[in-house]
Amino acid sequence: GCLTQLYENAFFRGGDVASMYTPNAQYCQMRCTFHPRCLLFSFLPASSINDMEKRFGCFLKDSVTGTLPKVHRTGAVSGHSLKQCGHQISACHRDIYKGVDMRGVNFNVSKVSSVEECQKRCTSNIRCQFFSYATQTFHKAEYRNNCLLKYSPGGTPTAIKVLSNVESGFSLKPCALSEIGCHMNIFQHLAFSDVDVARVLTPDAFVCRTICTYHPNCLFFTFYTNVWKIESQRNVCLLKTSESGTPSSSTPQENTISGYSLLTCKRTLPEPCHSKIYPGVDFGGEELNVTFVKGVNVCQETCTKMIRCQFFTYSLLPEDCKEEKCKCFLRLSMDGSPTRIAYGTQGSSGYSLRLCNTGDNSVCTTKTSTRIVGGTNSSWGEWPWQVSLQVKLTAQRHLCGGSLIGHQWVLTAAHCFDGLPLQDVWRIYSGILNLSDITKDTPFSQIKEIIIHQNYKVSEGNHDIALIKLQAPLNYTEFQKPICLPSKGDTSTIYTNCWVTGWGFSKEKGEIQNILQKVNIPLVTNEECQKRYQDYKITQRMVCAGYKEGGKDACKGDSGGPLVCKHNGMWRLVGITSWGEGCARREQPGVYTKVAEYMDWILEKTQSSDGKAQMQSPA
């Protein structure tokens, strides 16, 4: 299953399959997730080691048993790949690293006014993988405000150095934020020239394209079909690049197919997995296991659940079957692709779905009336779980926020439905940033069921929590994916990085905002909060957040929206925006429903509604 916990001061011994430099453990974990054989990783921050060569070292590891011995190493961080972790799988990495220079091939230098502008330039340059920016206080005046766009053979820095007044980060192309746009067309009977960066075997041009999209240096590809004249080259997928970023020439060639990486697509990237099953095809590779199962779909599920399995062949040969079950060959290779593809066989083959980010149809958990005042504009995909709950009577308007917690589930505040319990009047918009982008053609979800907490009473602040079951499940994308829930009764975790988001009022007597707002707010202890609200009972099932001096808070229109906190690189839904005295007033923190206290209720309702377990435990 999915394991998300990180091990501090621990280093996995042995099992190395690759190493690289990464700025932090989260980026190292992402590289492990996308590496075909990596199950475990260990990362050495600069503070953990004196050896300059090993600083920022990211070590990717494999293990036949799925685990490795841990040795104590001060400062080291280790953990698991996020294969099998559904919506948590993403190649998108937004963080900017201060005081760090990520080295690589510098191919473009320009003057810009901010690190955000530099990151934007990198994202909009086809060859840029990462960048460094010298701030206005950099010690050498001639380098100040320099934005260096970079690439490297592996897509990660060739070295990382601690350097004051330098900020570094990665291209946001994997976040589907590139302005370049992409070529969706694939071209039959056409071969591209230029430099081959890799060669893999694939059953079709679409798999070839997806592999190209997620390869750090592939910009375009040529695929040789299974009827290509040279038998040894059939099903070969050549991943390519060029200095210019486009093919310098193309040649008409029977039974070849060419196309482009989709990494520069805006708003939508292909999933990093291949779900099609290929009847009459055998995939060759290293044997991991052989098991008898009933049907090719069960074979694919078996492969997906066995984390080291990359692809499979289900044999229908009479000698491989007994009763209704046939042999399911679970296989792997060095590069994650079959080492041989044979056609016209009595088998059916396909790939593990371990990197599919749709995950299962569950709510995400982790094991172990109020808009934003004093906030700033959010950017695309920053808060992909945020939804807008709108009511359509004569006109249509935004009333509340909510959080996507599963394909078919939204968590919000019960008071949003005070006086409006009719599910037909509600429209739920997900994957949006600007309310003004909503037109009559914008897709929305309708409500199948509103589940208000049984102990909630109108005009009381207690148990202000409600679940919405959507009529149809939503697909996950970079802009629309769920937030993980905390573990039941989560009291031990100290959250220091918490944010509230919403389209609500920017001042007490304001109006709904167009762009989704965000504000960083510290949590306040319940004791402190109770002192500020002596006329109300602040219960253990509430959590408070706010600045003593006020100025930043949720407000009308944010109700039901998320209070999220980042811990160990992972966002969790800590609170649901509920109530407060005015907005952003001095010594009047916002009050939020404490999600951890309602985990039993959430799981009971999301499971019983479908009559099947919906629990996904990534840790």
């Epitope: 009827v227 039974n255 292909p270 779900s275 099609k276 009847p279 009459g280 016209g344």
Partner: antibody
Framework: EVQLLESGGGLVQPGGSLRLSCAAS????????MFWVRQAPGKGLEWVSS????????MYADSVKGRFTISRDNSKNTLYLQMNSLRAEDTAVYYC????????????WGQGTLVTVSS | DIQMTQSPSSLSASVGDRVTITCRAS??????LNWYQQKPGKAPKLLIY???SLQSGVPSRFSGSGSGTDFTLTISSLQPEDFTIYYC?????????FGQGTKLDIK
């Protein structure tokens, strides 16, 4: 030039049999997966059967399973559809089609042959 | 089997109009979606493959888009020869299935 030419259609009584042929030319027939697709009068397209380049595996629509048999003779560049126990609802124009490998579309179709099942 | 639902089943338009035909799959089919045009008494002709790639020789006024379950075929400026029947077809899993067709006729 790629060509597919169906033959063998005609009028047959319910319960009767018919064998359709599709002669292929202009390409290496033995490398391609081939299909039969039919279209009842005034209706849409319906996939009937498919066969791999080497002859196996074969697949059939539920509506024809157990009654129709697809086969091929790569030495003669010919695709066949043996139709037994014919029913009135099998009345249609039958097309043979070539699948373009690795992108899974029918790039070449025959002109079609009409099969009429009626007493 | 995967069901393919085309809408509308018939459509009236004029020469020069921009029209859109939609096709919905009963489950996700990635981009394994093709569009065909069929004229009376003729075999179908491929227009678009892989959801968005234009078959060689097909006029550029035809375009396709979509992935997952929802797809569209757009004809940017209708020509007299475009008034006929259009089918979508999924090639994600056997048996390949077709939509029921959309008949495009002159208003």
């Amino acid at each position: 030039e790629v060509q597919l030419l169906e033959s063998g259609g005609g009028l047959v009584q319910p319960g009767g049999s018919l064998r359709l042929s599709c002669a292929a030319s202009g390409f290496t027939f033995s490398l391609y997966r081939m299909f039969w697709v039919r279209q009842a009068p005034g209706k849409g397209l319906e996939w009937v059967s498919s066969i791999w380049s080497s002859g196996g595996p074969t697949m059939y629509a539920d509506s024809v399973k157990g009654r129709f048999t697809i086969s091929r003779d790569n030495s003669k560049n010919t695709l066949y559809l043996q139709m037994n126990s014919l029913r009135a609802e099998d009345t249609a124009v039958y097309y043979c089609a070539r699948e373009y490998p690795s992108t899974y579309y029918f790039d070449y179709w025959g002109q079609g042959t009409l099969v009429t099942v009626s007493s | 089997d995967i069901q393919m639902t085309q809408s509308p089943s018939s459509l009236s338009a004029s020469v020069g109009d921009r029209v859109t035909i939609t096709c919905r799959a009963s489950q996700s089919i990635s981009t394994y979606l093709n569009w065909y045009q069929q004229k009376p008494g003729k075999a179908p002709k491929l227009l678009i493959y892989g959801a968005s790639s234009l078959q060689s020789g097909v006029p550029s006024r035809f375009s396709g888009s979509g992935s997952g379950t929802d797809f569209t075929l757009t004809i940017s400026s209708l020509q007299p020869e475009d008034f006929t029947i259009y089918y979508c077809q999924q090639s994600y899993s056997d048996p390949y299935t077709f939509g029921q067709g959309t008949k495009l006729d002159i208003k």
